[in-house]
């Protein structure tokens, strides 16, 4: 960053999107700012306009191509700059040499569905979205189940240490409403972080069979 009160953080979704957030104390909300991407070994440059997301932070997505196109590799370095307009001039507010596969955050898993539900268990599957083929099977997942009377923050995390796009939830209560979420993370990358949580999937366990007299 150009000065100590500025923070510029970007993540690559592994395909064709770099999402950036820039925070700057004392910056004006109505200032026009751009993130400028300059790859070291590609023939394209890309910009996106930073839009305010809070009092002192701005965000935008560098869309590098169609969602599933592989626009960068592990050897790419992209110079990312925050440029803000000051009158008729543009001033560089922050800069970083961005290594995309060291700063990964995938898209949230999608297409969650109940494969099979019983009284005490439920089998759920999902799909990963816009994830690079470079990862092969080197992904891990975290999942959580929301039980009645609890919050998401209280839900214990279940870890899947392999590329497994399903889970069998057990020891559930019959005839009870639950919600389920999952997130994904590549094993690669020093600054890689978890994807956002998926949209919650609501499901209900089957009622217990009535006992015979």
């Amino acid at each position: 960053a150009v000065n100590g009160t500025s923070r510029f953080t970007c993540f690559y979704n592994s395909r064709a999107n770099i999402s950036c957030v820039w925070s700057q104390d004392g910056a004006l909300q109505d200032t026009s700012c751009q993130v400028h991407a300059w790859p070291d070994r590609r023939r394209w440059n890309q910009t996106c306009e930073l839009l305010p997301v809070s009092q002192a932070s701005w965000a935008c997505n560098l869309i590098l191509g169609t969602p599933d196109s592989q626009k960068l590799t592990a050897v790419d370095i992209v110079t990312l700059r925050v440029m803000c307009r000051e009158g008729v001039r543009w001033r560089m507010m922050a800069i970083q040499d961005f290594k995309p596969f060291e700063n990964l955050r995938l898209m949230a898993p999608i297409s969650l569905q109940v494969v099979h539900v019983e009284t005490h268990r439920c089998n759920i599957s999902w799909k990963i979205s816009q994830a690079s083929h470079y990862f092969e099977r080197h992904l891990e997942f975290e999942a959580r189940t929301l039980s009645p009377g609890h919050t998401w923050e209280e839900a214990p995390l279940m870890t899947l240490k392999q590329k497994q796009e399903w889970i069998c939830l057990e020891t559930l209560t019959p005839d009870t409403q639950y919600e389920f979420q999952v997130r994904v993370k590549p094993l690669q990358g020093e600054f890689t972080t978890w994807s956002p949580w998926s949209q919650p999937l609501a499901f209900r366990t089957k009622p217990a069979a009535l006992g015979k007299d």
Epitope: Q34, W44, N45, C48, T66
Partner: nanobody, 123 residues
């Protein structure tokens, strides 16, 4: 590669209005800063207006400020130029331009271009 098709040009009297449209296909529209340029007979192509990927920020050549409005509809992959209070000196072929780099949009050789639409303003 992105393709641009302009429409909406025509003959109008001084003081009248026209709305130009530029339909974009072949790539992700929101990647692009979009601009309008114009070229009058015997003159060089000149920048008229631009709009950022989000549509939040616009820029105009001084001679059209207050009369022209550039906008975009990211759902329809279209950029517009609303031209009011037209003057005879606005007569030109109007071109739509696209560039993934905001800082290159005024550079003639860096842009992708449409085929142009003729605007004629009679006095």
């Amino acid at each position: 590669q992105v393709q641009l098709v302009e429409s909406g040009g025509g003959l109008v009297q001084a003081g009248g209005s026209l709305r130009l449209s530029c339909a974009v296909s072949g790539d992700v529209f929101v990647r692009y800063t979009m601009a309008w340029f114009r070229q009058a007979p015997g003159k060089e192509r000149e920048f008229v207006a631009s709009v950022t990927d989000s549509g939040r920020t616009t820029d105009y050549v001084h001679s059209v400020k207050g009369r022209f409005t550039v906008s975009r509809d990211n759902a329809k992959n279209t950029v517009y130029l609303q031209m009011n209070n037209l003057k005879p000196e606005d007569t030109a072929v109007y071109y739509c331009a696209a560039n993934t780099d905001y800082f290159q949009i005024k550079s003639l050789d860096a842009n992708t271009w449409g085929q142009g639409t003729q605007v004629t303003v009679s006095s």
